[in-house]
């Protein structure tokens, strides 16, 4: 946030730039949290977009039956495994084809055993504030679809006659990792020293990291005709005077007229 | 790139004898599975006979005793000797390959194909 600067003033304003604000020769070039002529103002909003998709990943081992372990399938760049990981992917795409946040595989090690391939299963999700819950169901729908596949697709006489078999017991699930997004926790980092003050709401599922000086929020202050400002002690009302009012109290909302306390003949000091 | 080109194919009465061949090249042939599938009007593709890279074979039921499979590494050819074929044996016959050493018989797990030499069994 910058504010710039013109006339003689400049050379004093470059030295009073507040909260760690810097000048560039015309304007103090303020840091994220502050704005204003000397960045001596705290922003009552801050960005904390979440990502567009939150992504899972399952760590699994399958053992398939139908292909012997050769040499080659340890060298990634092979055109034995190359060949492998097609089918393999394409084995799982039909496996998975039911899951909206399915993404795709990758293999991470093939070894001897039949042939065990350990591997990741990619799932991805919009952000919704809901993005757990449905992340967590599509991970139990792939164990219960790997379950499924490993189970049925087996070899009966040596033989296999599915794109691929494999051994029932060799199915396992070693680790699930959730890309972690905690819109609260980034908004107290975010608020720094204010973020006793800083809190989340959400708006067409959307998370927004405010103090109570943004207007429009189920938090927000009414400083009726004054001024919102934050301060280390919180969120404080600075109230105006007009022509012919002073205002006061905690919400600005206690107004006194003038003319009651300078009399008809002092409409000014 | 992989190429595998079928030949043999023909019109034989039923009883009769016939010799289909696949000359595969870019494929090493001393490695992986290389089979013999056939599609009938209407049906879906079947495999008939497989064999590995370490000479391993295995065949499809109705076909058993009468088909044999074989390969030859030198000539990088692969080979399927039909005898006393029945009018049921009619079909679009393909060369398939894998650079795996696979014990499938589904037409899916395998990533070569040639074109297809007809088999007509008829009287």
């Known amino acids: 946030r910058t504010t710039t600067c013109f006339g003689d003033g400049c050379q004093n304003t470059a030295s009073r730039c507040k909260n760690g604000g810097t000048w560039d020769g015309l304007k103090c070039q303020c840091p994220n949290l502050y704005y204003g002529e000397l960045c001596e103002e705290v922003v009552s909003s801050i960005d904390i977009g979440p990502p567009e998709t939150i992504s899972a990943q399952m760590e699994l081992t399958v053992t398939v039956t139908s292909v012997k372990f050769t040499e080659e399938l340890k060298n990634h760049s092979s055109q034995e495994f190359q060949e492998f990981k097609q089918t393999f992917t394409e084995q799982m795409n039909i496996v998975y084809s039911g899951i909206p946040e399915y993404v795709g595989v990758n293999i991470t090690k093939l070894r001897l055993g039949s042939v065990v391939v350990e591997h990741d299963v990619l799932l991805r999700t919009k952000y919704t504030p809901e993005y757990k819950t449905v992340l967590d169901n599509a991970t139990e729908v792939v164990k219960e679809k790997i379950t499924k596949v490993t189970t049925q697709q087996i070899m009966i006489n040596d033989i296999c006659s599915d794109m691929m078999c494999f051994n029932t017991t060799g199915t396992q699930v070693q680790n699930i990792t959730v890309t972690q997004y905690d819109p609260e926790e980034d908004c107290r980092k975010m608020a720094k020293e204010y973020g006793d003050y800083f809190v989340v709401e959400y708006r067409d599922q959307k998370p927004y990291c405010i103090s109570p000086c943004e207007p429009g929020f189920s938090v927000s202050k009414n400083c009726n005709l004054g001024k919102c400002q934050m301060s280390l002690s919180g969120p404080q009302c600075l109230c105006v005077t007009t022509e012919t009012h002073w205002y006061s109290g905690e919400t600005c909302n206690q107004g006194t007229q003038k003319s009651l306390v300078y009399g008809h003949h002092h409409h000014h000091h | 790139d992989v190429q595998l080109v079928e030949s043999g194919g023909g019109l034989v009465q039923p009883g009769g004898s016939l010799r289909l061949s696949c000359a595969a090249s870019?494929?090493?042939?001393?490695?992986?599975?290389m089979a013999w599938f056939r599609q009938a009007p209407g049906k879906e593709r079947e495999g008939v006979a497989f064999i590995n890279s370490d000479g391993r074979t295995s065949y499809a039921e109705s076909v058993k005793g009468r088909f044999t499979i074989s390969r030859d590494n030198a000539l990088s050819s692969l080979y399927l000797q039909m005898n006393s074929l029945r009018a049921e044996d009619t079909a679009m016959y393909y060369c398939a390959a894998s650079l795996l050493y696979l014990m499938t018989v589904n037409a899916a797990a395998y990533p070569y194909w040639g074109q297809g030499t007809q088999v007509t069994v008829s009287s």
């Open positions: 870019g494929f090493p042939s001393s490695r992986g599975t």
